[in-house]
Interface confidence: medium
């Protein structure tokens, strides 16, 4: 039975040209995290494997930095980076947990972070 929940940074915004940390946290389970995938709508951004470390998708090598922790730092933001991001936690023995973050990249200098929220 899957008892865990994914807590994410929720709806967030950031300035064009800046950077943002995408962060998820798995709680309420003792399952072992074997791998975390970071995806953007229809593309893979990066993978963090418990044994092998980080794989950054070649398309994003120049703009994505691993961490902090299992999170991901997205740099040199453009308006095209606006959209949904997913953290996919592969765990044993529970299976797969998915969290969602919505990022809005703003032209203006006003970029406020949204509230945290949970996805069961």
């Amino acid at each position: 039975m899957m008892t865990g929940t994914i807590e994410t940074t929720g709806n967030i915004s950031a300035e064009k040209g800046g950077s943002i940390i995408l962060q998820c946290h798995l709680s309420s389970t003792t399952a072992q995290v074997t791998q975390v995938n970071w995806e953007q709508q229809d593309q893979l951004l990066a993978i963090c494997n418990a044994d092998l470390g980080w794989h950054i998708s070649p398309s994003f090598k120049d703009r994505v930095a691993p961490g902090p922790g299992l999170g991901l730092t997205l740099q040199s933001l453009t308006v095209n980076d606006t959209g949904e991001y997913f953290c996919i936690y592969h765990t044993y023995p529970d299976g797969t947990y998915t969290g969602r973050i919505f990022l809005e990249v703003l032209e203006s200098s006003v970029a406020e972070h949204g509230a945290r929220f949970q996805i069961p």
């Epitope: 709508q41 593309q43 893979l44 993978i47 044994d51 092998l52 398309s59």
Partner: antibody, heavy 118, light 107 residues
Framework: QLQLQESGPGLVKPSETLSLTCTVS??????????WGWIRQPPGKGLEWIGY???????YYNPSLKSRVTISVDTSKNQFSLKLSSVTAADTAVYYC??????????WGQGTLVTVSS | EIVLTQSPGTLSLSPGERATLSCRAS???????LAWYQQKPGQAPRLLIY???SRATGIPDRFSGSGSGTDFTLTISRLEPEDFAVYYC????????FGQGTKLEIK
């Protein structure tokens, strides 16, 4: 355990397009655990990576073949495919499909020989 | 592009002996990104070692991998008749490349 099976014509004429399909069983091609790749091996020679696709559709190709390669995925059929255009005799090889964890290739098809000849 | 050079090209040994196969990279490779495969005639390659030193599922413990940076080694501690095959190293940097292979043959 994953099983992969290549299928497609064994003979292709020069300048035409080579088309192969890989059918995955024992697991879902929509798993975010895997990349789905193609590797080839000319007779008596070593291995050359062609490219891979992620289930969401993003692809990455060997730069030396990029202009001629297209890899696509059909999640409804649990298959992925390779198209290699403008083939020459140098493209004659055993073509393998394989699953990749992003670092290495853990499950392989048995391979299919494709000969380019008129 | 990272070029992998394997040596020797052919290694002739007898069952029961120890085999040491070398793989040298043209530039430094993260240990996480180095794997070894075994290929027998008419068969697909089989993953033996990943992450430079971790054995894949079902691989006997007579196979071991070691190394870091530019120099990696596959060791078969005591050769069995079924171990005679071609061995390839493979790395993942920004793209995958394979070594040219080492043929392990019966002396």
């Amino acid at each position: 355990q994953l099983q992969l099976q290549e299928s497609g014509p064994g003979l292709v004429k020069p300048s035409e397009t080579l088309s192969l399909t890989c059918t995955v069983s024992g697991g879902s091609i929509s798993s975010s655990r895997y990349f789905w790749g193609w590797i080839r091996q000319p007779p008596g020679k070593g291995l050359e990576w062609i490219g891979y696709i992620y289930y969401r559709g993003s692809t990455y190709y060997n730069p030396s073949l990029k202009s001629r390669v297209t890899i696509s995925v059909d999640t409804s059929k649990n298959q992925f495919s390779l198209k290699l255009s403008s083939v020459t005799a140098a493209d004659t090889a055993v073509y393998y499909c394989a699953s990749s964890s992003a670092w290495y290739f853990d499950y392989w098809g048995q391979g299919t020989l494709v000969t380019v000849s008129s | 592009e990272i070029v992998l050079t394997q040596s020797p090209g052919t290694l002739s040994l007898s069952p029961g002996e120890r085999a040491t196969l070398s793989c040298r990279a043209s530039q430094s490779v993260s240990s996480s990104y180095l794997a070894w495969y075994q290929q027998k005639p008419g068969q697909a390659p089989r993953l033996l070692i990943y992450g430079a030193s971790s054995r894949a599922t079902g691989i006997p413990d007579r196979f071991s991998g070691s190394g870091s940076g530019t120099d990696f080694t596959l060791t078969i501690s005591r050769l069995e008749p079924e171990d005679f095959a071609v061995y390839y190293c493979q790395q993942y940097g920004s793209l995958y490349t394979f070594g040219q292979g080492t043929k392990l043959e019966i002396k």
